[in-house]
Interface confidence: low
């Protein structure tokens, strides 16, 4: 069963997805999307990475953290009572049926306090730089086919209930994460 | 090869307007951000204003706020600084250089040739 | 907005030294602190990102630190190309912000 996580109407949603890469800088392709995660893929696709960077994202949706290092943890900015549902993060593991699937539930509740509208085209009022709070990965990478063995040592998600993704980082940091496997 | 242009620049009157324009090639500026730096003569850097054209996100120096507008044409894979208002401290050389990654905060890790703007009567 | 005090202002150095220039922030960047080198007429170019993490391509001679708000570039062994203005550039909040930069000129 999926893992829930709220946020407010207005406020930033956090998902998290995590991965070790088998080495620095060798990326496994990611792919997060709206709904369950079928068998093959990801459907209704949001976000994807590839094995150097994010070559496919749409509006308010981000990867916060450092996706260099295998955080791939989603940020919905600005969320809606439409933005509810399940949403997939899968972590695309090369050879048949290797993938890590997480269905991470959304449950967004209304505001408290009605919040004073988003400027959608100012960065800084939609979602603030202040939010980064860690360095990025190895300068270079490697395609995936050089490594004719990919040893994923984590994979692992956050259980918490968080929003901020500086509480997430620093909770990371300090071994707050499932081991899954 | 990565490789960022600008052009646009020149001499212009307090007051007037000026576009630059920063072309980028071999990157697609939807999975970046690009800034603006300017660099007055015998100065230091001076970020400007910066641009996530995926999702329209934009970010200005409050010296330049309301008078600059950064923006994007992701088909001709350039950003543009529309300057109006000039003044004379804004001489300087621009530079475009583009984010380490997608996110709107980060390192530059590709840098234009810079243009030169005058501000002058 | 976040001030990055950078020093010195400049320096004098052989080739063969050791070079060491600091920036401190006047708040909490955690690690997101780039490093430029810019010689004259030229763009700067990217040395050093996320504190101590090395740029692609970028001579081994070059290191990044940190210690709290205060971030260390060092130059292990001066070559006649690494002479230059340096800059430091915080980049964890808006507006980013760079030092002032260090030039380092020959002794």
């Known amino acids: 069963s999926e893992v829930e996580y709220r946020a407010e109407v207005g406020q930033n949603a956090y998902l998290p997805c995590f991965y070790t890469p088998a080495a620095p800088g060798n990326l496994v392709p990611v792919c997060w999307g709206k709904g369950a995660c079928p068998v093959f893929e990801c459907g209704n696709v949001v976000l994807r990475t590839d094995e150097r960077d994010v070559n496919y994202w749409t509006s308010r949706y981000w990867l916060n953290g450092d996706f260099r290092k295998g955080d791939v943890s989603l940020t919905i900015e600005n969320v809606t009572l439409a933005d509810s549902g399940i949403y997939c993060c899968r972590i695309q593991i090369p050879g048949i049926m290797n993938d890590e699937k997480f269905n991470l539930k959304l449950v967004i509740k209304p505001a408290k306090v009605t919040p004073a509208p988003t400027r959608q085209r100012d960065f800084t009022a939609a979602f603030p730089r202040m939010l980064t709070t860690r360095g990025h990965g190895p300068a270079e990478t490697q395609t995936l086919g050089s490594l004719p063995d990919i040893n994923l040592t984590q994979i692992s998600t956050l259980a918490n209930e968080l929003r901020d993704s500086r509480l997430a980082n620093d909770l990371r940091d300090s071994g707050a994460t499932i081991r899954i496997g | 090869e990565v490789q960022l242009v600008e052009s646009g620049g020149g001499l212009v009157q307090p007051g007037g307007s000026l576009r630059l324009s920063c072309a980028a090639s071999?990157?697609?500026?939807?999975?970046?951000?690009i800034h603006w730096v300017r660099q007055a003569p015998g100065k230091g850097l001076e970020w400007v204003a910066d641009?996530?054209?995926?999702?329209?996100?934009?970010d200005y120096a409050d010296s330049v706020k309301d008078r600059f507008t950064i923006s994007a044409d992701t088909s001709k894979n350039t950003a543009y600084l529309q300057m109006n208002s000039l003044r004379a401290e804004d001489t300087a050389v621009y530079y475009c250089?583009?984010?380490?990654?997608?996110?709107?905060?980060?390192?530059?890790?590709?840098w234009g040739q810079g243009t030169l703007v005058t501000v002058s009567s | 907005d976040i001030q990055m005090t950078q020093s010195p202002s400049s320096l004098s150095a052989s080739v063969g030294d050791r070079v060491t220039i600091t920036c401190r922030a006047s708040?909490?960047?955690?690690?997101?602190v780039a490093w430029y080198q810019q010689k004259p007429g030229k763009a700067p170019k990217l040395l050093i990102y996320?504190?101590?993490f090395l740029y692609s391509g970028v001579p081994s001679r070059f290191s990044g630190s940190r210690s709290g708000t205060d971030f260390t570039l060092t130059i292990s062994s001066l070559q006649p190309e690494d002479f230059a203005t340096y800059y430091c550039?915080?980049?964890?909040?808006?507006?980013?912000?760079f030092g002032q930069g260090t030039k380092v000129e020959i002794k």
């Open positions: 250089a583009r984010g380490y990654v997608y996110r709107m905060w980060d390192s530059y890790d590709y």
């Open positions: 641009i996530a054209p995926a999702g329209g996100y934009t």
């Open positions: 708040q909490d960047v955690n690690t997101a």
């Open positions: 550039q915080q980049h964890y909040t808006t507006p980013p912000t």
């Open positions: 071999g990157f697609n500026i939807r999975n970046h951000a």
């Open positions: 996320s504190a101590s």
